[in-house]
């Protein structure tokens, strides 16, 4: 299976999104410019819908300058984000408390610099195992209704668990069509057997699959964003099939229950 890393296609177009062969895997980072075409139909995330405002206060956007979203992230501590390791960039900005994709000022927004990014030492580009990274912000957040952390689940997900994934990633695939506002999508955790059947020899216990039969999926640009189950952070958007939302090819997410010790110890050691 050919791997196509799309997290950085806005700055070095090795694999532009419209040339990735069907049926290949892709990391789900992207570049959504402030002038990206927005999708006026009801087709969201892929077949999700606009999130209700103030319901995802842990959702962060990672931006390349000037205001180009390339990945999502999650606030897990007043000064720390989690995102996918494949979203690592040396220079980026962090936006919290913002609902729309466009850079227009919103009263609840808070902007930050990342002062330290710590990928999991077991991550291996361009692979998918251990696809997580901690980012330390240049200061603590000011907790508000729009900006607050979420707890990471120490319990591993069971098949059938209902979860919510969110992001500003493309709402169509293989075309690239970015939404106006943050998208939310209800998905169900699949059994590890179904996950392994969908992606033979590519799944390990640092990943889980989620989706449904109705063509709902996360996609390019959602990478690093949250999968929330029963009120706590269960996973991060990591990778999936290309195009997104194909039957029997679910999204694959970083299985955070396997990393709670590493997350806690890394934050403590660097605070």
């Amino acid at each position: 299976v050919t791997e196509h890393v799309l997290a950085n296609n806005d700055v070095s177009c090795d694999h532009p999104s419209n040339t990735v062969p069907s049926g290949s895997n892709q990391d789900l980072g992207a570049g959504a410019g402030e002038d990206a075409r927005s999708d006026d139909s009801s087709s969201r995330i892929i077949n999700g819908s606009d999130c209700d405002m103030h319901t995802q206060p842990w959702q962060a956007a990672l931006l390349l300058r000037p205001n180009q979203l390339y990945c999502g992230a999650v606030l897990v501590h007043p000064q720390w984000l989690l995102t996918a390791a494949h979203c690592r960039k040396k220079v980026f900005r962090v936006r919290l408390g913002h609902y729309s994709l466009s850079p227009v000022y919103e009263s609840g927004q808070q902007m930050f610099q990342g002062v330290k990014s710590i990928p999991h030492p077991g991550y291996s580009h361009p692979g998918h195992s251990n696809d997580l990274m901690l980012i330390k912000l240049n200061r603590r957040i000011r907790p508000t209704k729009d900006v607050r952390p979420i707890n990471v689940s120490s319990h591993c997900p069971s098949a059938g668990t209902k979860c919510l994934v969110s992001g500003w990633g493309t709402t169509k695939s293989p075309q690239v069509h970015f939404p106006k506002v943050l998208q939310c999508l209800n998905i169900s955790v699949l059994s590890q057997k179904r996950c392994e059947d969908a992606y033979p020899r590519q799944i390990d216990d640092t990943m889980f699959c989620a989706g449904d039969k109705a063509g709902r999926d996360s996609c390019q640009g959602d990478s690093g964003g949250p999968v929330v189950c029963n009120g706590s952070l269960q996973g991060l958007v990591s990778w999936g099939d290309y195009p997104c939302a194909r039957p029997n090819r679910p999204g694959v997410y970083t299985n955070l229950c396997k990393f709670t010790k590493w997350i806690q110890e890394t934050i403590q050691a660097n605070s």
Epitope: V91, Q113, P121, H125, P126
Partner: antibody
Framework: EVQLQESGPGLVKPSGTLSLTCAVS????????MSWVRQPPGKGLEWIGD???????DYASWAKGRVTISVDSSKTQVSLKLSSVTAADTAVYYC???????????WGQGTLVTVSS | AIDMTQSPSSLSASVGDRVTITCQAS??????LAWYQQKPGKAPKLLIY???TLASGVPSRFSGSGSGTDFTLTISSLQPEDFATYYC????????????FGGGTKVEIK
């Protein structure tokens, strides 16, 4: 054209301060991290430090307290100052741009600084 | 602190040879490793970043592999212009680091 050009005195007296500038052209400093690297004659590359657009600076542990890296107000030059120099600081000094994926893709031609009385 | 160790420090090879240079990190640096080529009197040139991604304009005879602590730069068929010194550099962390670069490997004509 994307270019980096180091400049500064080629000779510095022991215990003095080495001051170099790196003129940046062809790209905005606001989008990239910049590194200073040096190479003593006949030896390998030594990392000195990085400066980010947010003015966050990382220094090599040997350089802390002796080195200052900064960007000028016009955002067209990166500066390096190294204090209390000795003969061991004699080297070719390079500035370089990070490609945002942790690789130094653009380098200056380097400038030789000799520490001698 | 993370230390980068390159081996060998020098090697002799002929045009057309397959050449392998290794770089070992004292602890895992995941995939954040770059390789550079430097010729006498010149600035280094980026060859590979993210352990295996070829930099723009670099010939395909250069390849990089590895993750964690062990990395390899391979030149599949050595060309006359490849005789130079090669350096690895870790980009995993800048915290408490003496040097991000390895000590270098000089590739000489046999």
């Amino acid at each position: 054209e994307v270019q980096l050009q180091e400049s500064g005195p080629g000779l510095v007296k022991p215990s003095g301060t080495l001051s170099l500038t790196c003129a940046v052209s062809g790209f905005p400093l606001s989008n990239y991290a910049m590194s200073w690297v040096r190479q003593p004659p006949g030896k390998g590359l030594e990392w000195i430090g990085d400066i980010y657009p947010s003015d966050i600076i990382d220094y090599a542990s040997w350089a802390k307290g002796r080195v200052t890296i900064s960007v000028d107000s016009s955002k067209t030059q990166v500066s390096l100052k190294l204090s209390s120099v000795t003969a061991a600081d004699t080297a070719v000094y390079y500035c370089a741009r990070d490609n945002n994926d942790y690789g130094l893709d653009i380098w200056g031609q380097g400038t030789l600084v000799t520490v001698s009385s | 602190a993370i230390d980068m160790t390159q081996s060998p420090s020098s090697l002799s090879a002929s045009v057309g040879d397959r050449v392998t240079i290794t770089c070992q990190a004292s602890q895992s640096i995941s995939s954040w490793l770059a390789w550079y080529q430097q010729k006498p009197g010149k600035a280094p040139k980026l060859l590979i970043y993210l352990a295996s991604t070829l930099a723009s304009g670099v010939p395909s005879r250069f390849s990089g592999s590895g993750s964690g602590t062990d990395f390899t730069l391979t030149i599949s068929s050595l060309q006359p212009e490849d005789f130079a010194t090669y350096y690895c550099q870790q980009g995993y962390t800048n915290s408490n680091i003496i040097n991000t670069f390895g000590g270098g490997t000089k590739v000489e004509i046999k």
